[in-house]
Amino acid sequence: EEELQVIQPDKSVLVAAGETATLRCTATSLIPVGPIQWFRGAGPGRELIYNQKEGHFPRVTTVSDLTKRNNMDFSIRIGNITPADAGTYYCVKFRKGSPDDVEFKSGAGTELSVRAKPSAPVVSGPAARATPQHTVSFTCESHGFSPRDITLKWFKNGNELSDFQTNVDPVGESVSYSIHSTAKVVLTREDVHSQVICEVAHVTLQGDPLRGTANLSETIRVPPTLEVTQQPVRAENQVNVTCQVRKFYPQRLQLTWLENGNVSRTETASTVTENKDGTYNWMSWLLVNVSAHRDDVKLTCQVEHDGQPAVSKSHDLKVSAHPKEQGSNTAAENTGSNERNIY
């Protein structure tokens, strides 16, 4: 009779993570008598995957009933496959021996490759805010995928970006891989509502790419423009001066009025109006009692936005034309944008 051969018909098997792998193995003869064992790896360090005789193999089931006398199918199923299960699996026939069974013949091996989905891409932007016209970097990371081939694209508001660098690690063979990409984005004043998107396409995603997003509202700082204007006189000795603070983002803003360099009032932007582009406008006004001043008054609107150095705009108030009112010791009546007088 012809000597027993161990046949592993599949040179390779590709399985998705979480699924069950079937590793096929048949023997061509019932003789010699002895068990089958499955191993991962070929050398002495090989790992035991299944032993027909004994052991604990919770993830392994046999395809056919190995207790049947005439059984020659020694195929196994391994459940809940992960990338760590990748490797070459050998079906090995042992000959009954005393005290130990003796290895008789091995199959040629089946290489198990695991397809694993990439994790959801995580996009992170710069630690500090930047102003329009500046270039900022965004990173995108995704992990745990296999095989190595993967495509990553960057978009800003649906428009594909071209200035980015991508690395897939490791360079060589591995059970799973990671991708890391850095994109450069030029900010504009209209970017408060903009989004940067990192899109990852992989064979395991069946044409439905994964996306990670970052809102540029977390990254951008749009500095305000200031305009100080003198309004028509409200009363004989009072002038209303307004400071228009326009197109700023984020909302965090503190305004200080100075009269001839002396602090008159400080307030924090509260009831702001939002523009279509996501930036904010705010107005503060000051009632100046011109009769309290002998000379011209220099009014300064000083704004500190989002912790940045203050910017200011000044307005010279001519007082020479106004009659001096005796006994007045209040130089200004301070009024905020909410139209309430503060006395």
Partner: antibody
Framework: DVQLVESGGGVVRPGESLRLSCAAS????????MNWVRQAPGEGLEWVSL???????YYADSVKGRFTISRDNSKNTLYLQMNSLRAEDTAVYYC???????????WGLGTLVTVSS | EIVLTQSPGTLSLSPGERATLSCRAS??????LAWYQQKPGQAPRLLIY???TRATGIPDRFSGSGSGTDFTLTINRLEPEDFAVYYC??????????FGGGTKVEIK
Amino acid sequence: DVQLVESGGGVVRPGESLRLSCAASGFTFSNFAMNWVRQAPGEGLEWVSLISVTATTYYADSVKGRFTISRDNSKNTLYLQMNSLRAEDTAVYYCAKVTWNNLFDYWGLGTLVTVSS
Amino acid sequence: EIVLTQSPGTLSLSPGERATLSCRASQPIDSYLAWYQQKPGQAPRLLIYNTVTRATGIPDRFSGSGSGTDFTLTINRLEPEDFAVYYCQHQYDWPPYIFGGGTKVEIK
């Protein structure tokens, strides 16, 4: 968590014997080949012996015929019987699990064997 | 039997610097090379295998490269905990398992 704990080290005279043990936990001991690796004071790593999952044994030339590796899967324990000890066997002996692709992925903290007259 | 030669024997560097460790095989070994780190009084720890693949939990400042007979372990921006002895190992299927003689990375 995988743990390997060696014991049995000590001081012996040349020619004497010692038996090292390694208690394993946190993995299916019987499914993996196990090794002894040693490190002489101030020196590098030297592989000593391996026992496969089918209890086949392998030895470095320097210990062949004097050392015997064995395993008791029911006790999750690896052993190294060291006979005819020599001064050059003085080392820290590590028990190490080996992967299917020949990597020493887990090590014990080691046990010191000193052979001195 | 393959011999693995590591150089230099000792590397004196400051934290933040880059360390480049070499391992040369006496004959080609494809990409079957691993690296281990050993700190004083501790057991070795697997760092890299298959020349380039980081083991679980190993930070990305550690990277491996090479093929055939010449292999390199690079540690970018040395951290205080990286000062240790590093060994290369041939991941060959059959014993004896071969280790290099080691490179000590010490603080300058």
